[in-house]
Amino acid sequence: TVPPMVNVTRSEASEGNITVTCRASGFYPWNITLSWRQDGVSLSHDTQQWGDVLPDGNGTYQTWVATRICQGEEQRFTCYMEHSGNHSTHPVPS
C-alpha cells in the first residue's frame, strides 16, 4: 500500500466564486475516496466534479475532485480522503 499525497488548490471562477480542487497522487491501490465537505457534512454528488483515477506512470495512481464555493467561505470547506484504512481532512488554503 502506498498512501496518497493530497494537495488542495484554489482558483478564481466567476465574480464572488472560487473553484477549490483537491488532488491525490502517488497512491496504490486505486480505490480512494476523495470528496468535499461543508461544515463537516458531505456535499451532494451533483455539486462536485471528479477526475478519473488514472495511472501516473510510476505504478501508482492520481485523481482529483473540485467544487465551486463562495469567496470568503473557504474555512467552511474541507477535502476528505479515505484510502486503505486511513483517512485525513484537508482545508482550503487562505
Epitope: 475516496t33 451532494s44 454528488h45 476528505y80 479515505e82 484510502h83 484504512g85 486511513n86 483517512h87
Partner: antibody
Framework: QVQLKESGPGLVAPSQSLSITCTVS????????VNWVRQPPGKGLEWLGM???????DYNSALKSRLSISKDNSRSQVFLKMNSLQTDDTARYYC??????????????WGAGTTVTVSS | DIQMTQTTSSLSASLGDRVTISCSAS??????LNWYQQKPHGTVKLLIY???SLPSGVPSRFSGSGSGTDYSLTISNLEPEDIASYYC?????????FGGGTKVEIK
C-alpha cells in the same frame, strides 16, 4: 470476506428509543463508511444515514432530529440510535457498507437486516 | 428530495424472457444511479452501479442503461434465481433515495 450483521431488540414500545448494532468483519471501519437503510413491511427502502471512516456522519434530514450514528472501530461495530419511535418506524433495518470512488457511490455489501416492531 | 419512480410495481415473465424494468427521477441525476436486487427472504445485493457498471460476480445477463431522468435495468434471459424485487437508487443529491421497487415473478 466482507460481512455485516445487525442485532436489535425486536420489539420497542411507542415513544421509546431504538438501539441497533451492526458488527462488521472483513474490512476496517477506520477506512470505509457504513450506511443504515430501513424497509417498512411491504414498502420500499429508505436511507437513514451513514458514518464515514473518520467518524463524521451524514443523516437523512427528515429523520436527523431523532437519529444518532456512532461506532467503535476497535470492536468493529456501528451503532444506530433512534428516539421517539412510533408505529410507522416498524421496519427491517439494514446496515450496508458504502463504497465511494469518485463518481461512483454504492452500497456494495448488506447485512441480512433486523426486524423492529413498534408496538405496546 | 429527489423522487424515484418505478411505475411497474410487479411483472410476470417466463423463464428465458428479456425483462426490462424502468425507473425515472424527478430531476436530472447525471447517471448517478444504482440498482439493487432483494430476494423474497430479504437479502439485498448490489446489481448495477453508476447506471451501467456490473460488480464482479453479477451475471452478464444483467445490464443497465439510461441518462438524465430515465433509466432501465434489463435481464436478458430470465432465470429462476432472478425472482426478486429490484430497486433503483439515486445518489446525485443527499439523501440517496430509492424507487418503490419492481417485483419480478414467473408466469
Amino acid at each position: 470476506q466482507v460481512q455485516l450483521k445487525e442485532s436489535g431488540p425486536g420489539l420497542v414500545a411507542p415513544s421509546q428509543s431504538l438501539s441497533i448494532t451492526c458488527t462488521v468483519s472483513g474490512f476496517s471501519l477506520n477506512g470505509q463508511g457504513v450506511n443504515w437503510v430501513r424497509q417498512p413491511p411491504g414498502k420500499g427502502l429508505e436511507w437513514l444515514g451513514m458514518i464515514w471512516g473518520d467518524g463524521s456522519t451524514d443523516y437523512n434530514s427528515a429523520l436527523k432530529s431523532r437519529l444518532s450514528i456512532s461506532k467503535d472501530n476497535s470492536r468493529s461495530q456501528v451503532f444506530l440510535k433512534m428516539n421517539s419511535l412510533q408505529t410507522d418506524d416498524t421496519a427491517r433495518y439494514y446496515c450496508a457498507r458504502g463504497a465511494h470512488y469518485g463518481k461512483r457511490w454504492y452500497f456494495d455489501v448488506w447485512g441480512a437486516g433486523t426486524t423492529v416492531t413498534v408496538s405496546s | 428530495d429527489i423522487q424515484m419512480t418505478q411505475t411497474t410495481s410487479s411483472l410476470s415473465a417466463s423463464l428465458g424472457d428479456r425483462v426490462t424494468i424502468s425507473c425515472s427521477a424527478s430531476q436530472n441525476i447525471n447517471n448517478y444511479l444504482n440498482w439493487y436486487q432483494q430476494k423474497p427472504h430479504g437479502t439485498v445485493k448490489l446489481l448495477i452501479y453508476y447506471t451501467s457498471s456490473l460488480p464482479s460476480g453479477v451475471p452478464s445477463r444483467f445490464s443497465g442503461s439510461g441518462s438524465g431522468t430515465d433509466y432501465s435495468l434489463t435481464i436478458s434471459n430470465l432465470e429462476p434465481e432472478d425472482i426478486a424485487s429490484y430497486y433503483c437508487q439515486q445518489y446525485s443529491k443527499l439523501p440517496p433515495t430509492f424507487g418503490g421497487g419492481t417485483k419480478v415473478e414467473i408466469k
